[in-house]
Structures are given as C-alpha cells and as structure tokens.
C-alpha cells in the first residue's frame, strides 16, 4: 500500500529574469526513491536517476540546473515559463508518487512565495 505523501512548494511566483527552485519532498514512506522526473504536461525537463545521475533535456540545458537535492532550479525566467510543473517520484516498492507546482512569472517585483501544501 502507498502510504507516502508528496509535499511541494505549491503555488509560487517569481520575477521575470530571475530564478526559482522547484522542490518536492516525499515523506511518510520507507520506499526507496530510484528516480525523480521533472516535467511539464507535454515535456520532460529533467531526470535524476539514482544510478545514472542527472539528465537535463537539451531544450532546457541553458536555463535549468540540477538541485538542490532532488529539486530543480529554473533560471532566466520568462513569462512563458508560467504554468504547471510536476515532480514524479519513482519508488520501490511503492510505485510512483506525483506532485504539482504552479509557477507564475511576474513582470514586476511583487513576486511572493505561496504556502506549502500536500498531495496525498
């Protein structure tokens, strides 16, 4: 039975031209994390595999940095980066856990971080 929960940074905002850390955390399970995918609805940004290390999609190589930890740093943000981002944790023996982050990239300097929330 899958007992874990994914905690994410939830709804977040950042300024155009700045950077943001996308972070998920898996808790309440002893399952082993073997891979984490970072994706948009129709595009894979990055994969962190326990054996193979990090893979960054060529389309994002210039603007995406691995880490911290299993998170992902997006740099040189544009308004087009606004949207949903998903972390997909591959675990053994539980299977996959997924979390959602919504990023809003703002033109002005009124960006604030949203509250953390959990997805069961």
């Amino acid at each position: 039975m899958m007992t874990g929960t994914i905690e994410t940074t939830g709804n977040i905002s950042a300024e155009k031209g700045g950077s943001i850390i996308l972070q998920c955390h898996l808790s309440s399970t002893t399952a082993q994390v073997t891979q984490v995918n970072w994706e948009q609805q129709d595009q894979l940004l990055a994969i962190c595999n326990a054996d193979l290390g990090w893979h960054i999609s060529p389309s994002f190589k210039d603007r995406v940095a691995p880490g911290p930890g299993l998170g992902l740093t997006l740099q040189s943000l544009t308004v087009n980066d606004t949207g949903e981002y998903f972390c997909i944790y591959h675990t053994y023996p539980d299977g996959t856990y997924t979390g959602r982050i919504f990023l809003e990239v703002l033109e002005s300097s009124v960006a604030e971080h949203g509250a953390r929330f959990q997805i069961p």
Partner: antibody, heavy 121, light 107 residues
C-alpha cells in the same frame, strides 16, 4: 475500477468528419490527461494528441493539427476526438488512453476498447 | 520528432525461452521509454515505464533496461500468453512516438 468505453464503429465517405467518444468512469475525470492514439490495419501505433479535461488544454501531433479536434465534457466525463477531411489512409482503430498517474508522465496505463473507423467511397 | 526503431520486427520462440527485444531512439531520451503488449483485436497493455519500472500487476518475468538511445525488453521465460506484438514508446517529448512493433510467434 478505471474504465474507458468508446463509441461504436463508423463508416465514412472521403471528405467527411468522424467524432469518436470515450466515456471515463472509476476515477476523477478532470485529474488525468486523456490521449488519443490510432492504429491502421496491420500497422503500428500513432499518437494523435492529448487533452487536459480539467482545463481543456490540448496538444496535437503536428501531423494532425488542423484536422483533429480533441474536446472533453466534464459533466458527462467524456472525451471526444473529431477528425475532419477524412481520407482512405485514416482507416484505423482509434483508441483513447489515460496516463497512469495524476499529473504523471506520458505512459498510457488504461485504454479504451478501440473504435474502428473505415473511410471508403 | 523522435524516431523509435525496434528489432527484430518478428521472432519465433518456444515456451520457456528467454526473449529479448531492442528499441533504439533517434536521440537521447534518458530513461523515458515505455513498453506495451498487444494481442490481435485488443488494446495495448502497459508493461514497463521509465525504461525499467514494472507496471503494477505485470508478471516479474518481464523486465526493461537501458538509457540514452538503447533499450531492451526481456521476457525471462516465455509463457503461452506472451505470444503477442510488443511496442516501445518514448515519453520524453511531444509528439509521443512508438516503435513499429515486434511480433513474438510460436516456433
């Protein structure tokens, strides 16, 4: 349990349109993306496009852009794929499929039974 | 678009045999490959996702491996119900693309 039930077989004339439905049950319809895939007789699988039933957002294979329209009706938990300007090469079995996880990667864990569309004059 | 090339296109094997099917991507797709089994007149069934993760309920005789451009589906001991066509699919980028299929027939 998760089920995707598709509409029945269709026979169409070249130039006509066809609309295939896919009724979902056993899960929260708006939480999972629905994909459409087709398979011509004796051939492999070809991805047509995807819809997010929650937002209505779509993405299409460039090959089908302008001819395929994917929609979803939240009130009936039904996704639709309409293909216009039909030609004989569109004769195929059309499948709807659902991703395995909420927000998950594009591997397809649940499939409809398929709808045969025959285009013939 | 990313092309997925499977080999062989067909093979003959006996019950109990170890069977290996390969899939090559036209560019690096990391581990974003799934494998499906399809029987005549039926919808495909998911076997493996993310190159090596066995989907829930799939027998452990099926396994997947590979990363980058080269991927393998292995059936450790072929069972009568495994005679079918197998497809690889990349879930790395849009449009999603499939291999042309490998038909596993009875020898």
């Amino acid at each position: 349990q998760v089920q995707l039930v598709q509409s029945g077989a269709e026979v169409k004339k070249p130039g006509a349109s066809v609309k295939v439905s896919c009724k979902a049950s056993g899960y929260a319809f708006t939480n999972y993306l629905i994909e459409w895939v087709r398979q011509a007789p004796g051939q492999g699988l070809e991805w047509i496009g995807v819809i997010n039933p929650g937002s209505g957002g779509t993405n299409y294979n460039e090959k089908f852009k302008g001819r395929a329209t994917i929609t979803a009706d939240k009130s009936t938990s039904t996704a639709y794929m309409e293909l216009s300007s039909l030609r004989s090469e569109d004769t195929a079995v059309y499948f709807c499929a659902r991703r395995g996880d909420k927000y998950g990667s594009a591997w397809f864990a649940y499939w409809g039974q398929g709808t045969t569309v025959t285009v013939s004059s | 678009d990313i092309q997925m090339t499977q080999s062989p296109s067909s093979l003959s094997a006996s019950v109990g045999d170890r069977v290996t099917i390969t899939c090559r991507a036209s560019q690096d797709v990391s581990t974003a490959v799934a494998w499906y089994q399809q029987k005549p007149g039926k919808a495909p069934k998911l076997l493996i996702y993310s190159a090596s993760f066995l989907y829930s309920g799939v027998p452990s005789r099926f396994s997947g491996s590979g990363s980058g451009t080269d991927f393998t589906l292995t059936i450790s001991s072929l069972q009568p119900e495994d005679f079918a066509t197998y497809y690889c699919q990349q879930h790395y980028s849009s449009p999603r693309t499939f291999g042309q299929g490998t038909k596993v027939e009875i020898k």
